[in-house]
């Protein structure tokens, strides 16, 4: 990388035009963020905030159960993920204020902007994993008695981790550091060394792996165990149907936009004025996927509120009651409430 | 009428420093970049540096270590000063300009300076 | 850095040919801002560069239209219409979207 003596932040964005103007310098630039960017930078504030202290607490909630409870593995996990990809932001929020100018080297390029891939591949396979266990414990409860243990659920959290990092290196090996001649500044993004066909290719794999197939299975999978537990009148809670609904729409609602973008740019080039617009939205799309960050906490508490009635507990031992209450598996056929209340909490997040 | 115009030493011991000046005219030093390239049978066209308008400067990484960019705003100078020079090191020397458009090409170049290295 | 390639090396043309050089770069040359900062020049024997065209296909001030830039991404071409006297000497393409602007070695049009 050639050397860079990044001495003056007052460069900005540097929109350039086609016009010969004799009365604006080239090397005079806009110090202005724009909208998009702003909107991003407010976003990242709240969910590293959120996040970190939400996902530190349900660690710390879960992490003592964790042996015992299953639940409470799916839980810990989840936020493990989601605690990792916050710790990016400070970083992730430093750039966007310099203009999107990049000091922190190739390294950290590589790692801290794919940490939130990381997480979408880690959250969607956690929560297929977990799906997996509520549709078992409705369909298959006698083989649960026997199998499901804590060593099980372990072991099924290591491969969802194994494939989420597996999933990543594309994203990962891509990054580089480019670095502009004017206005000064080095960026830090994806390089397919114009090779649009594997840039499509990166682009839909990540579509359909960490978007369409498993909002797919999700659907049928919770449409499924839903219309069960209704025909079983196991129970009839609304708060059951409203908490799965939040925790499965919010990571499909939230990686949306980034997504969508993604694939348009990959088909688009990069001199397109489409191309331009979509590159401009690109962080606040980011900050908006990071909004995953720090849901589930938040879907927690508000699913806590309302097992509970009003808040009277203390927020760990709302977090508590919610994230490890273990799902009891009968030899008959039906099931306690408690079964189907677990459903409610994040562990099928989506 | 934009000019640029460079003076140096023409001839340069090994191991010793060289110092061009390029002075211009037809436009401000306080607006505009002012780049340094250099030409040489072995190397062809290779870019120096910039010192831009609000005094930030950018090298060549290959270079860095014994190259300085500088310049005199009210004089309408800018300096090039360089290291330890070797014999690779001898080329004509170019000051060049982007005024007036927004292409970042070097719109405008001084008649060079050629720098010998030798004893 | 990146790397600038020019073929041909050397192109021998009758004067009212059409000549055609080819650049092609190691990486993209789009900038963020969706420009592409690939620019041509024209170097005569004992002269400076002048430039000729800039950002890929526009022509810089007082430079004849029978010259033309097109291209994106890595790979461009500059045309010469119908080649004049005037027109003889050493083409350079060249890049400043990255750091460090970077050259072609040169393409030398002469007479056949």
């Known amino acids: 990388m050639d050397s860079f003596n990044y001495t003056t932040p007052d460069y900005g964005h540097y929109d350039d035009k086609d016009t010969l103007d004799l009365n604006t310098p080239v090397d005079k630039t806009s110090n202005t963020l724009r909208v998009p960017d702003i909107l991003a930078l407010v976003i990242f504030a709240v969910v590293f905030l959120v996040g970190v202290l939400g996902n530190a607490l349900v660690v710390w909630v879960t992490a003592f159960e964790a042996k015992r409870t299953i639940n409470a593995i799916w839980f810990l996990n989840l936020a493990v993920a989601d605690f990792l990809s916050c710790l990016a932001l400070p970083i992730l929020f430093t750039s966007i204020v310099q203009h999107h100018h990049w000091p922190f080297g190739g390294a950290a390029c590589s790692i801290l902007p794919s940490l939130i891939l990381l997480n979408m591949y880690a959250s969607i396979l956690l929560l297929a994993t977990i799906s997996a266990d509520r549709f078992l414990l409705v369909f298959k409860p006698i083989w649960c008695q026997n199998f499901r243990g804590a060593g099980l659920a372990w072991i099924a959290c290591a491969v969802a981790w194994g494939l989420a990092l597996l999933l990543t290196i594309p994203s990962f090996l891509y990054r580089v550091v480019r670095e502009e001649y004017f206005p000064p500044k080095v960026l830090c993004g994806v390089d397919y060394s114009h090779d649009k066909r594997r840039e499509r290719a990166v682009a839909i794999v990540r579509l359909v792996l960490g978007f369409l197939w498993p909002l797919l299975t999700l659907t049928i999978c919770y449409t499924f165990i839903l219309l069960r537990t209704w025909s079983r009148r196991a129970t009839r809670s609304t708060k059951t149907l409203k908490v799965v609904v939040a925790v499965v729409a919010s990571f499909f609602i939230f990686w949306l936009p980034y997504q969508v973008t993604g694939i348009m740019m990959s088909f688009l080039e990069p001199s397109s004025p489409t191309f331009l617009l979509l590159k401009k939205l690109d962080s606040l799309c980011v900050s908006f996927a990071y909004i995953n960050c720090c849901i589930n906490p938040i879907i927690y508490v508000v699913a806590g509120q309302g097992f509970q009635g009003r808040l009277r507990k203390s927020l760990p031992s709302l977090l508590r009651n919610v994230l490890t209450e273990e799902s009891v598996v009968r030899e008959s056929k039906s099931f306690t409430r408690s079964t189907v209340d677990t459903m409610a909490q994040k562990t099928q997040a989506v | 009428q934009v000019q640029l115009k460079e003076s140096g030493p023409g001839l340069v011991a090994p191991s010793q420093s060289l110092s061009i000046t390029c002075t211009v005219s037809?436009?401000?030093?306080?607006?505009?970049?002012v780049d340094w390239v250099r030409q040489s049978p072995g190397k062809g066209l290779e870019w120096l540096g910039v010192?831009?308008?609000?005094?930030?400067?950018n090298y060549n990484s290959a270079l860095k270590s014994r190259l300085s960019i500088s310049k005199d705003n009210s004089k309408s100078q800018v300096f090039l000063k360089m290291n330890s020079l070797q014999t690779d090191d001898a080329a004509m020397y170019y000051c060049?300009?982007?005024?007036?458009?927004?292409?970042?090409?070097?719109?405008?170049w001084g008649q060079g300076t050629l720098v010998t290295v030798s004893v | 850095d990146v790397v600038m390639t020019q073929t041909p090396l050397s192109l021998p043309v009758s004067l009212g040919d059409q000549a055609s050089i080819s650049c092609r770069s190691s990486?993209?040359?789009?900038?963020?801002?969706?420009?592409?900062?690939l620019h041509w020049y024209l170097q005569k024997p004992g002269q400076s560069p002048k430039l000729l065209i800039y950002?890929?296909?526009n022509r810089f001030s007082g430079v004849p239209d029978r010259f033309s830039g097109s291209g994106s991404g890595t790979h461009f071409t500059l045309k010469i219409s119908r080649v004049e006297a005037e027109d003889l000497g050493i083409y350079f393409c060249?890049?400043?979207?990255?750091?460090?602007?970077?050259f072609g070695g040169g393409t030398k049009l002469e007479i056949k």
């Open positions: 060049a300009s982007h005024y007036g458009y927004d292409g970042l090409g070097f719109a405008y």
């Open positions: 037809g436009f401000s030093l306080t607006s505009y970049g």
């Open positions: 010192i831009w308008g609000v005094g930030s400067t």
């Open positions: 990486q993209s040359l789009v900038h963020s801002s969706g420009n592409t900062y």
């Open positions: 950002k890929v296909s």
């Open positions: 060249s890049q400043s979207t990255l750091v460090p602007p970077t």
